[in-house]
Interface confidence: low
């Protein structure tokens, strides 16, 4: 339905509160380093020209389009060229290239200072003394550091961010109250943006059809008592949401998905009994809800597959006739069988199940070629088990924090070419795994693991993009988006790297390192594992065990010290000595 | 009462230096980053450099990097910023805050670089 003015529309729906917060989180995407005063000013101005056009469609300028209005909004901006460089040239663009342009520019990994949490009377005080300010200042900081946060999502995360606020801030103890809703907050929304940035980039390098392929497979899985049409309908919605969220159409993305929440809410009789709760919230919680649902239980009796995708003898014509419903539906039944399987193994399934049929259709005995497709079919499934199995059982063996540590040195031999803080915050993630996934009985640990890992490797696909340095890297990422896992797993170590030059800076600690959170710790050490296997990437692991242990006993002993300082000096070259000669550099 | 003094401004040739102070009170200063953040006359604030609670970890604008260094001394409460190679361009009063947030809390120390 078109309207004489989108502006005005979109304002309409979404309500004042909202149509700012989200123009602000679209600005601070696209602008990642422009100050929050630059950003609050432009929001106003758009919001003030969004109010004329309420009380007047026809007045001027607001029968524009939203990327027009908003990226001449972008453009006025003066420090442009300095601070940006050539993304300033988009602006010389007409739409819809513009956009296409900004939306190129958009930075995974800005250089921006790390977030620094205030004490606690310090951020209380600021949220009373002017709670619109503080909760702006969220949403820009958050959003300008992650470009492709899910914004109808941040505006849930901003609602809970006061809500710990309003209740802490008033507590007998506003740290114990505060501190462990806003960490929680930080963990919540840095799996949801890296599950966000999957999405996206699944539609952007993959194309629709990935995504929808995706959808219909999880949506299966979470509804398997709702019909086929009925799940294609959810899925083409939810592929207009998360297209608009990529591309920046904030205001459209975040009016349908309030939308398409009503639509499951009204049906959901025809969608899932797990529903009920969910559809009771109010909008954002509801939004939350739905897409963190538990999967409905099966219908009972589910007749076997082989009949209609293997045994019919109509399957090349039902294939020939209508391709990607076809597929489609071998997918939705796959995969609504099997709530234990991930969704990369599912699509892995049907893509199998399609090359064999592009093979077959054109052979003289159709039925005699494909007879023993899903024969094809338990390697594939065998690949992610025997994998989840093993290393769940090294996670068991070794802890969360030696677990990241072995698969930090397993990336590393594979790609020692990627830059260490991006090996380290992808290895550290990746080792996760074990403590989010390996708790659940076996029918869950697949779907948690293998589905974890794809949005983990997305983040080093992503990182990878802006600076590539390594041809293997490229070839995982971009050949094949549900193989990716698969292919990382299969590179052994990259006999072709030469090992960097040895640095004795590189391992040179000083006494901040005890003042430093565990975690920093952690971080610190795993580092210089890193650059070690980065000097030495044929040794063993006995070798950096041994190393490693050292390090740690140094760092436990010179922060016991009473001249920290010196110790770290003197026993630091004395490790640095014993290392090089145990390692042999 | 959390407290933020800025000093150590002034009126610099082109190409000269100065080393600002931020004397900070009210607040554990070692638990916090802080930053350096300026305003040019007619102009919003613009961020400058960071440095975590440590000291190990710096950031800095593209504008400024090579030319100005950020330092904090625990044990005196004190942020430093050491400018050199200073260009007209650079002149805007400069404030130090908590954390990365450009919104000013104090009053700040004026920079002028002019022949």
């Known amino acids: 339905d078109a309207h004489k003015s989108e502006v005005a529309h979109r304002f309409k729906d979404l309500g004042e509160e909202n149509f700012k917060a989200l123009v602000l989180i679209a600005f601070a995407q696209y602008l990642q380093q422009c100050p929050f005063e630059d950003h609050v000013k432009l929001v106003n101005e758009v919001t003030e020209f969004a109010k004329t056009c309420v009380a007047d469609e026809s007045a001027e300028n607001c029968d524009k389009s939203l990327h027009t209005l908003f990226g001449d909004k972008l453009c006025t901006v003066a420090t442009l060229r300095e601070t940006y460089g050539e993304m300033a040239d988009c602006c010389a663009k007409q739409e819809p290239e513009r956009n296409e342009c900004f939306l190129q520019h958009k930075d995974d990994n800005p250089n921006l200072p790390r977030l620094v949490r205030p004490e606690v009377d310090v951020m209380c005080t600021a949220f009373h003394d002017n709670e619109e300010t503080f909760l702006k200042k969220y949403l820009y900081e958050i959003a300008r550091r992650h470009p492709y946060f899910y914004a109808p999502e941040l505006l849930f995360f901003a609602k809970r961010y006061k809500a710990a606020f309003t209740e802490c801030c008033q507590a007998a103890d506003k740290a114990a109250c505060l501190l462990p809703k806003l960490d929680e907050l930080r963990d919540e929304g840095k799996a949801s943006s890296a599950k966000q940035r999957l999405k996206c980039a699944s539609l952007q390098k993959f194309g629709e059809r990935a995504f929808k392929a995706w959808a219909v497979a999880r949506l299966s899985q979470r509804f398997p008592k709702a019909e086929f049409a009925e799940v294609s309908k959810l899925v083409t919605d939810l592929t207009k949401v998360h297209t608009e969220c990529c591309h920046g159409d904030l205001l459209e993305c975040a009016d349908d998905r309030a939308d398409l929440a009503k639509y499951i809410c009204e049906n959901q009789d025809s969608i899932s009994s797990k529903l009920k709760e969910c559809c009771e919230k109010p909008l954002l919680e509801k939004s939350h809800c739905i897409a963190e649902v538990e999967n409905d239980e099966m219908p009972a009796d589910l007749p076997s597959l082989a009949a209609d995708f293997v045994e019919s003898k109509d399957v090349c014509k039902n294939y020939a006739e209508a391709k990607d419903v076809f597929l489609g539906m071998f997918l939705y039944e796959y995969a609504r069988r099997h709530p234990d399987y991930s969704v990369v193994l599912l699509l892995r399934l049907a893509k199998t199940y399609e090359t064999t049929l592009e093979k077959c259709c054109a052979a003289a005995d159709p039925h005699e070629c494909y007879a023993k497709v899903f024969d094809e079919f338990k390697p594939l499934v065998e690949e992610p088990q025997n994998l989840i199995k093993q290393n769940c059982e090294l996670f068991e063996q070794l802890g969360e924090y030696k677990f990241q540590n072995a698969l930090l040195v397993r990336y590393t031999k594979k790609v020692p070419q990627v830059s260490t803080p991006t090996l380290v915050e992808v290895s550290r993630n990746l080792g996760k795994v074990g403590s989010k996934c390996c708790k659940h009985p076996e029918a869950k640990r697949m779907p948690c693991a293998e589905d974890y890992l794809s949005v983990v490797l997305n983040q080093l696909c992503v990182l990878h993009e802006k600076t590539p340095v390594s041809d293997r890297v490229t070839k995982c990422c971009t050949e094949s988006l549900v193989n990716r896992r698969p292919c990382f797993s299969a590179l052994e170590v990259d006999e072709t790297y030469v090992p960097k030059e040895f640095n004795a800076e590189t391992f040179t600690f000083h006494a901040d390192i005890c003042t430093l959170s565990e975690k920093e710790r952690q971080i610190k050490k795993q580092t210089a594992l890193v650059e070690l296997v980065k000097h030495k990437p044929k040794a063993t692991k006995e070798q950096l065990k041994a190393v490693m242990d050292d390090f740690a006993a140094f760092v436990e002993k010179c922060c016991k010290a009473d001249d920290k300082e010196t110790c770290f000096a003197e026993e630091g070259k004395k490790l640095v000595a014993a290392s090089q000669a145990a390692l042999g550099l | 009462q959390v407290q933020l003094v800025e000093s150590g401004g002034g009126l610099v040739q082109p190409g000269g230096s100065l080393r600002l102070s931020c004397a900070a009170s009210?607040?554990?200063?070692?638990?916090?980053?802080m930053s350096w953040v300026r305003q040019a006359p007619g102009k919003g604030p613009e961020w400058v450099s960071a440095?975590?609670?440590?000291?190990?970890?710096?950031r800095y604008a593209e504008s400024i990097k090579g030319r100005f260094t950020i330092s904090r001394d625990n044990a005196k409460k004190t942020l430093y910023l050491q400018m050199n190679s200073l260009k007209p361009e650079d002149t805007a009063v400069y404030y130090c805050?908590?954390?990365?947030?450009?919104?000013?809390g104090s009053q700040g120390t004026q920079v002028t670089v002019s022949s």
């Open positions: 805050t908590i954390g990365q947030s450009t919104s000013r």
């Open positions: 009210g607040f554990t200063f070692g638990s916090f980053g």
């Open positions: 440095i975590d609670s440590g000291g190990t970890d710096t």
